[in-house]
Interface confidence: low
């Protein structure tokens, strides 16, 4: 069964700067990745970035830099201030649309005891929804 992992890290240098990394553990060809915050996209979440293997990357504030790390993983840097700033308990979700597996999504947030800049290695997160 395909799985999605999500890792959230707060940067030590800037407390309002977060790095989100997501990956897809499956054999299919990824056709789209959607990153959202505040819950799953379409369930109250707000889209931060859309990454398409062919047509490129689209991102929206406070996302600062979205990029492909590998053909099956992405990273997203958020820089917020004021109302648009993520907080420590913000939930981030990544949804991978893959052919032929379908859509797989997982969410994660900053580990409760995490120090800025420190984070455990990525582990598979629970799959919230398979469309």
């Amino acid at each position: 069964t395909p799985e999605v992992w999500v890792q959230v890290r707060m940067e030590a240098t800037e407390l309002s700067s977060f790095t989100i990394r997501c990956g897809f553990l499956g054999s299919g060809s990824i056709s789209l990745v959607t990153v959202s915050w505040g819950g799953p996209n379409g369930a109250g979440g707000t889209t931060l970035a859309v990454l398409h293997p062919e047509r490129g990357i689209r991102q929206w504030a406070p996302a600062r830099q979205a990029r492909w790390e590998t053909q099956s993983s992405i990273s997203l840097i958020l820089e917020g201030s004021g109302a648009s700033s993520p907080c420590a308990n913000t939930t981030f979700c990544c949804k991978f649309a893959s052919f032929p597996e379908g859509s797989w999504e997982a969410c994660g947030s900053l580990p409760p005891s995490s120090d800025p800049g420190l984070s455990a290695p990525p582990t598979p997160a629970p799959i919230l929804r398979a469309d």
């Epitope: 789209l32 959607t34 996209n41 889209t47 398409h52 062919e54 047509r55 490129g56 990357i57």
Partner: antibody, heavy 123, light 106 residues
Framework: QVQLVQSGAEVKKPGSSVKVSCKAS????????ISWVRQAPGQGLEWMGG????????NYAQKFQGRVTITADESTSTAYMELSSLRSEDTAVYYC????????????????WGQGTLVTVSS | DIQMTQSPSSLSASVGDRVTITCRAS??????LNWYQQKPGKAPKLLIY???SLQSGVPSRFSGSGSGTDFTLTISSLQPEDFATYYC????????FGGGTKVEIK
């Protein structure tokens, strides 16, 4: 070669709404975002917002947030832009354009463009 | 929002002249910049994308350069069909157009 064909000119009363369509032909519709740009008489270009038809994600310029709705119908390869609470300052030519991009980058540009739709707001 | 400032807003030139139009972003946009040409009553036409890449079918007399905040569109030898309005556009964070530069016949 992708072509975008827009609906015809409209005359609207202040306070009403207008819905302009943009039909794509000759290419894959769903994978490319469609943006809407307007140009008031004698003025420059102003990006209003855009939509990625699949999965239907729309984003809007802050200026138009709450007043513009952009949708897409994949079955007919048509994008729509609806602008509400029209005022005389909304008199402009409205263009749709396809966001074309380079894979794995954030380089995007508009090509091709629709022919434009003149919307006149007058009492 | 990222603001794009074009200069000059208009210029007069003759056929054969070298024309330079500049565009400045209010913050660094790397090379996420495009240039368009628009003639009266027509839709804009893409000339240059990604700051310096020439769109297919566009004459080589058009060139673009720059990165960060300062960009330039150059027409090496102005032709009669080049009299038009030119716009820059950033695509780093959403989209913003410059105010335009009208190139008129001297």
């Amino acid at each position: 070669q992708v072509q975008l064909v827009q609906s015809g000119a409209e005359v609207k009363k202040p306070g009403s709404s207008v819905k302009v369509s943009c039909k794509a032909s000759g290419g894959t519709f769903g994978n490319y975002a469609i943006s809407w740009v307007r140009q008031a008489p004698g003025q420059g270009l102003e990006w209003m917002g855009g939509i990625i038809p699949i999965p239907g994600i729309a984003n809007y310029a802050q200026k138009f947030q709450g007043r513009v709705t952009i949708t897409a119908d994949e079955s007919t390869s048509t994008a729509y832009m609806e602008l509400s609470s029209l005022r005389s300052e909304d008199t402009a030519v409205y263009y749709c354009a396809r966001d074309t991009g380079r894979g794995y980058t954030r380089h995007f540009w508009f090509d091709p463009w629709g022919q434009g739709t003149l919307v006149t707001v007058s009492s | 929002d990222i603001q794009m400032t074009q200069s000059p807003s208009s210029l007069s030139a003759s056929v054969g002249d070298r024309v330079t139009i500049t565009c400045r972003a209010s913050q660094s946009i790397s090379s996420y910049l495009n240039w368009y040409q628009q003639k009266p009553g027509k839709a804009p036409k893409l000339l240059i994308y990604a700051a310096s890449s020439l769109q297919s079918g566009v004459p080589s007399r058009f060139s673009g350069s720059g990165s960060g905040t300062d960009f330039t569109l150059t027409i090496s030898s102005l032709q009669p069909e080049d009299f038009a309005t030119y716009y820059c556009q950033q695509s780093d964070i959403l989209y913003t157009f410059g105010g335009g530069t009208k190139v008129e016949i001297k």
